[in-house]
């Protein structure tokens, strides 16, 4: 058993049929010695008396808010949550496996630049009685500070018969060094509590590996005289690290016909313009990627050819 | 470059960008076997990293690029020695189309651009490598190339910025 926060405790249980469970001793936070009784949740049934209460925690029915009283007055509470371990593996019932970029990916994180700011998100089908708490650091043995905000519900989607809820959190490294080569990864830890179930999820990454620039901005077409060609131009996204002579992007320009089956013409360039042939009913799209490190491409910025 | 003269920024920029491309193309082609995360000991912890105080940020380069260039040179020599070690020259043999050989030569080429014959910076950090067991090598190669990708990305940014802003 360990303390998650004040008056909230997590009991770690091996979860299998007829498991013996864990013996837990609760102590009432009071100077009083006599006349103390214990109850669980809203029940008025007295579970025991005395300053300490010893219970055998085997299942969710044994978890909940234990309260010690004296003469009708509440002295203190202890909330017991369960953390299940099945076949040596901690349960992951609360969050959905996003399966990207690999199986058992529950947390996904992205950064728009090298400033040390990043966003993580996760999915669940649970809509109520759900709380999250997020901590982060750079490295684990001698951790350096990363400050995370509160996790918030950022999207709701309908997937077949189910509703899916996306939560996200923003974090900022306290002393970021955008130009340095990271040697210690960022660690992100999410505590999830659903009713009386506790789970924790972790992710470890370098900012460089989660970079995904915003799409190029101000995408424009300029027809070239007496030609089917156009000059496409764009600019670095505002959110990208500066100076651009140091934090350089590379770009992919794509001409795509109306039909998805039509052949796509693609051009790669380090410049912020390119000359392409604009077909009727086609659209021109441009996306960006770090020039020197193959992290994710941005989403496409698009304009119609006409 | 030792002694304070300027490097050939544009040549360094071109070669460092080529190094980035090679490091990424070499990464999946490090051997004939499936990579298993056997023996996941931290073996690449001792590689030289370009750290915050090394002056490789735009301001540091403007103030005095020598600190940064020396750090990059140390890293290039270190990785060049790693790529020539039995981790890469021993079994499992590299795939026939592996660009590790080209990568190795380019690391040497860039380090020579930074330190021409007869000029010397202080003693380099040399990899202390006991011969690795063959079964460890795929994972070691994988980790070394991952680490090299990060190192050459910073070096390429330095040379690109230098070519754009510090070239005579």
């Amino acid at each position: 058993i360990w303390e998650l926060k004040k008056d909230v405790y997590v009991v770690e249980l091996d979860w299998y049929p007829d498991a013996p469970g864990e013996m837990v001793v609760l102590t009432c936070d009071t100077p009083e010695e006599d006349g103390i009784t214990w109850t669980l949740d809203q029940s008025s049934e007295v579970l025991g008396s005395g300053k300490t209460l010893t219970i055998q925690v085997k299942e969710f029915g044994d978890a909940g808010q234990y309260t010690c009283h004296k003469g009708g007055e509440v002295l203190s509470h202890s909330l017991l949550l369960l953390h299940k371990k099945e076949d040596g593996i901690w349960s992951t019932d609360i969050l959905k496996d996003q399966k990207e970029p690999k199986n058992k990916t529950f947390l996904r994180c992205e950064a728009k630049n090298y400033s040390g700011r990043f966003t993580c998100w996760w999915l669940t089908t649970i809509s109520t009685d759900l709380t999250f708490s997020v901590k982060s650091s750079r490295g684990s043995s001698d951790p350096q500070g990363v400050t995370c905000g509160a996790a918030t519900l950022s999207a709701e989607r309908v997937r077949g018969d189910n509703k899916e809820y996306e939560y996200s959190v923003e974090c900022q490294e306290d002393s970021a060094c955008p130009a340095a080569e990271e040697s210690l990864p960022i660690e992100v830890m999410v505590d999830a509590v659903h009713k009386l179930k506790y789970e924790n999820y972790t992710s470890s990454f370098f900012i460089r590996d989660i970079i995904k620039p915003d799409p190029p901005k101000n995408l424009q077409l300029k027809p070239l005289k007496n030609s089917r060609q156009v000059e496409v131009s764009w600019e670095y996204p505002d959110t990208w690290s500066t100076p651009h002579s140091y934090f350089s992007l590379t770009f992919c320009v794509q001409v795509q016909g109306k039909s998805k089956r039509e052949k796509k013409d693609r051009v790669f360039t380090d410049k912020t313009s390119a000359t392409v042939i604009c077909r009727k009913n086609a659209s021109i799209s441009v996306r960006a990627q770090d020039r020197y490190y193959s992290s994710s491409w941005s989403e496409w910025a698009s304009v119609p050819c006409s | 470059v030792p002694g304070g003269s300027s490097p050939a920024w544009t040549q360094c920029q071109q070669l460092s960008q080529k190094l980035c491309t090679l490091a990424w193309s070499a990464h999946p082609l490090v051997g004939h076997m499936d990579l298993r995360e056997e023996g996941d000991e931290e073996t690449t912890n001792d590689v030289p990293h370009i750290q915050c105080g090394d002056g490789c940020d735009p301001q540091g380069l403007r103030d005095n690029s020598q600190f940064c260039l020396q750090r990059i040179h140390q890293g290039l020599i270190f990785y060049e020695k790693l790529l020539g070690s039995d981790i890469f020259t021993g079994e499992p043999s590299l795939l026939p189309d592996s660009p590790v050989g080209q990568l190795h030569a380019s690391l040497l080429g860039l380090s020579q651009l930074l330190q021409p014959e007869g000029h010397h910076w202080e003693t380099q950090q040399i990899p202390s490598l006991s011969p690795s067991q063959p079964w460890q090598r795929l994972l070691l190669r994988f980790k070394i190339l991952r680490s090299l990708q990060a190192f050459v990305a910073v070096a390429a940014r330095v040379f690109a910025h230098g070519a754009a802003t510090l070239s005579p």
């Epitope: - | 004939h32 076997m33 298993r36 056997e38 020695k81 020539g84 070690s85 039995d86 020259t89 021993g90 079994e91 499992p92 043999s93 050989g101 190795h104 490598l129 011969p131 067991q133 063959p134 079964w135």
Partner: antibody, heavy 115, light 107 residues
Framework: EVQLQQSGPEVVKPGASVKMSCKAS????????IHWVKQKAGQGLEWIGY????????KYNEKFKGKATLTSDRSSSTAYMELSSLTSEDSAVYYC????????WGQGTLVTVSA | DIVMTQSPATLSVTPGDRVSLSCRAS??????LHWYQQKSHESPRLLIK???QSISGIPSRFSGSGSGSDFTLSINSVEPEDVGVYYC?????????FGSGTKLEIK
């Protein structure tokens, strides 16, 4: 085409030393280790060790430490093995090979130790 | 050191037979096992690497299987030119060790 050309047969007296060579061609000499393997007449194969011509790093089978010394000369793309304090037990064919998971072996050097 | 044990020591076969040669390692070597063929007065020739990977120029009748500590070299239709001694080799850890060989002869 990759080739490993070994030096010719040697007849040596007990207690003497012998140095044999393995000249590599058709590839970058420093890009691969070179192993040495012993085979006594009518018997199996025994791994002696390898040299990495890039940095002259060596790895020996404990059994051959003090018996075999591996060296290389990058200028001539040649690997060498010297065997010292020879006895009749050292009479064998010695092969050089470029990585044991590749199909490149020298033709072997026969060493005969005889008074 | 890892000990490689080959069986049988000798195998007499008829051309066209399918044969299996066995090799056992004294501890797990994953798939780090190579097979060689050596004909009389010739250098060894690599047949199979990493337990099952084929080698360019080696006839397709030769195949390998196994992982951990038990390995098999199969020749699915023996030809008269397949006579010789077949060795397996531990390529997992130093010192590299070879099996004592299986001699294949034609009846």
């Amino acid at each position: 085409e990759v080739q490993l050309q070994q030096s010719g047969p040697e007849v040596v007296k007990p207690g003497a030393s012998v140095k044999m060579s393995c000249k590599a061609s058709g590839y970058t000499f420093t890009s691969s280790v070179i192993h040495w393997v012993k085979q006594k007449a009518g018997q199996g194969l025994e791994w002696i060790g390898y040299i990495n011509p890039y940095n002259d790093g060596t790895k020996y089978n404990e059994k051959f430490k003090g018996k075999a010394t591996l060296t290389s000369d990058r200028s001539s793309s040649t690997a060498y093995m010297e065997l010292s304090s020879l006895t009749s037990e050292d009479s064998a064919v010695y092969y050089c090979t470029r990585r044991l998971d590749e199909a490149y072996w020298g033709q072997g050097t026969l060493v005969t130790v005889s008074a | 050191d890892i000990v490689m044990t080959q069986s049988p020591a000798t195998l007499s076969v008829t051309p066209g037979d399918r044969v299996s040669l066995s090799c056992r390692a004294s501890q797990s070597i994953s798939e780090y096992l190579h097979w060689y063929q050596q004909k009389s007065h010739e250098s060894p020739r690599l047949l199979i690497k990493y337990a099952s990977q084929s080698i360019s120029g080696i006839p397709s009748r030769f195949s390998g299987s196994g992982s951990g500590s038990d390995f098999t070299l199969s020749i699915n239709s023996v030809e008269p030119e397949d006579v010789g001694v077949y060795y397996c080799q531990n390529g997992h850890s130093f010192p590299f060790t070879f099996g004592s060989g299986t001699k294949l002869e034609i009846k």
